[in-house]
């Protein structure tokens, strides 16, 4: 299973639920579906209040139990380590795959943390991070921001990922903006 890691803003905007949580248990495999679930302890929710309604406490995260079908395998054994998890809601359950944005909270830049906590949401409605994977790339719309990290650095951990958000400058126009300048 292969997928291009998304810009964190894309992960935020395309997810139903974005939370901070600790993985606290060994995965359990459902013997009917061959899906596995990890027990988690949620510490913060950044997106999904409306989608979840009253069931605002997520206790498990679900994923295919196999690598070949894009299952997520949690390798850290540190149960006190917090992770940013961006996933989809299916039947009220949080689902993730290999392609989901799951990262140790401590590995995120201060700018990314700020993005997840308050800024990425501003760009969700109007703006699109547009991956540039090979030259030449052209902006297809004024609301697109060209994401060149992977082209220039071969990594999703480039400057645009770690420090910038694609945000509205004026109606019909989005540009890369420093998350530092977004401090309230």
């Amino acid at each position: 299973c292969t997928c291009v890691p998304p810009h964190p803003q894309t992960a935020f905007c395309n997810s139903d639920l974005v939370i901070r949580a600790k993985f606290v248990g060994t995965p359990e495999v459902n013997q009917t579906t061959l899906y596995q679930r990890y027990e988690i302890k949620m510490t913060k929710m950044y997106k999904g209040f409306q989608a979840l309604g009253d069931a605002a406490d997520i206790r498990f995260v679900y994923t295919p139990a196999m690598e070949s079908v894009c299952g997520y395998f949690h390798r850290s054994h540190n149960r006190s380590e917090e992770f940013l998890i961006a996933g989809k809601l299916q039947d009220g359950l949080l689902h993730i795959t290999t392609c989901s944005f799951v990262a140790p909270w401590n590995s995120l830049s201060l700018a990314q943390r700020r993005g997840f906590t308050k800024t990425y949401t501003v760009g969700c409605e109007e703006c699109t991070v547009f991956p540039c994977l090979s030259i030449p790339c052209k902006l297809q719309s004024g609301t697109h921001c060209l994401w060149t990290d992977q082209l220039l650095q071969g990594s999703e951990k480039g400057f645009q990922s770690r420090h910038l958000a694609c945000l509205p400058r004026e109606p019909g126009l989005c540009t890369w903006q420093s998350l530092r300048s977004q401090i309230a």
Partner: antibody, heavy 113, light 111 residues
Framework: QVQLVESGGGLVQPGGSLRLSCAAS????????MSWVRQAPGKGLEWVSA????????YYADSVKGRFTISRDNSKNTLYLQMNSLRAEDTAVYYC??????WGQGTLVTVSS | DIALTQPASVSGSPGQSITISCTGT?????????VSWYQQHPGKAPKLMIY???NRPSGVSNRFSGSKSGNTASLTISGLQAEDEADYYC??????????FGGGTKLTVLG
């Protein structure tokens, strides 16, 4: 109690086909993923294929991918393994197994000219 | 491909205890609590002795016990008896290959 009974084994020529069946009883068949495991003469155990309880998801070992097809009929409590393009190295006793515990007695498949 | 490592053979005298190890990785034995142990006598089907690391199916003697530490699972047989002589296989759920087995351990009961 849990019972799994395999059938359909036999002698087949290289390149031929065979369909194995496994009749299950003593448990709610549709509630369990099932798998096929094989054991070549004098050798260890090798996982072959698995299928989810609904039959919607199937998985195969690299050695049989593209040649074998696992399926199930939950209304008949039966698991199947369709084996095509058989090779000499597929010669083995084939066991039907419930995830992750009970096995049948096995059925012998011999691929030889 | 043998994914889990077991000793090829172990032996013990009647009444003794023996332990068979089964070493895997963090994506199989270490990552899940789904390790099973099977006993196989010549010409017979494997018989489930332990499932989910340490649980015994009804009808299996309490002389058989299972445990796990890190990436290694163990089967211990206490009060060894002549009928325990057989091949023993460990099996684990595996994130990469679905199900993986050990290569098998031949248990010989001496005397």
């Amino acid at each position: 109690q849990v019972q799994l009974v395999e059938s359909g084994g036999g002698l087949v020529q290289p390149g031929g086909s065979l369909r194995l069946s496994c009749a299950a009883s003593g448990f709610t068949f549709s509630s369990y993923a099932m798998s096929w495991v094989r054991q070549a003469p004098g050798k260890g155990l090798e996982w072959v294929s698995a299928i989810s309880g609904s039959g919607g998801s199937t998985y195969y070992a690299d050695s049989v991918k593209g040649r074998f097809t696992i399926s199930r009929d939950n209304s008949k409590n039966t698991l199947y393994l369709q084996m095509n393009s058989l090779r000499a190295e597929d010669t083995a006793v084939y066991y039907c197994a419930r995830f992750f515990d009970y096995w049948g007695q096995g059925t012998l498949v011999t691929v030889s000219s | 491909d043998i994914a889990l490592t077991q000793p090829a053979s172990v032996s013990g005298s009647p009444g003794q205890s023996i332990t068979i190890s089964c070493t895997g990785t963090s994506s199989d034995v270490g990552g899940y609590n789904y390790v099973s142990w099977y006993q196989q006598h010549p010409g017979k089907a494997p018989k489930l002795m332990i499932y989910d690391v340490s649980n015994r199916p009804s009808g299996v003697s309490n002389r058989f016990s299972g445990s796990k530490s890190g990436n290694t699972a163990s089967l211990t047989i206490s009060g060894l008896q002549a009928e325990d002589e057989a091949d023993y296989y460990c099996q684990s759920y595996d994130f990469i290959n679905v199900i993986v087995f050990g290569g098998g351990t031949k248990l010989t009961v001496l005397g």
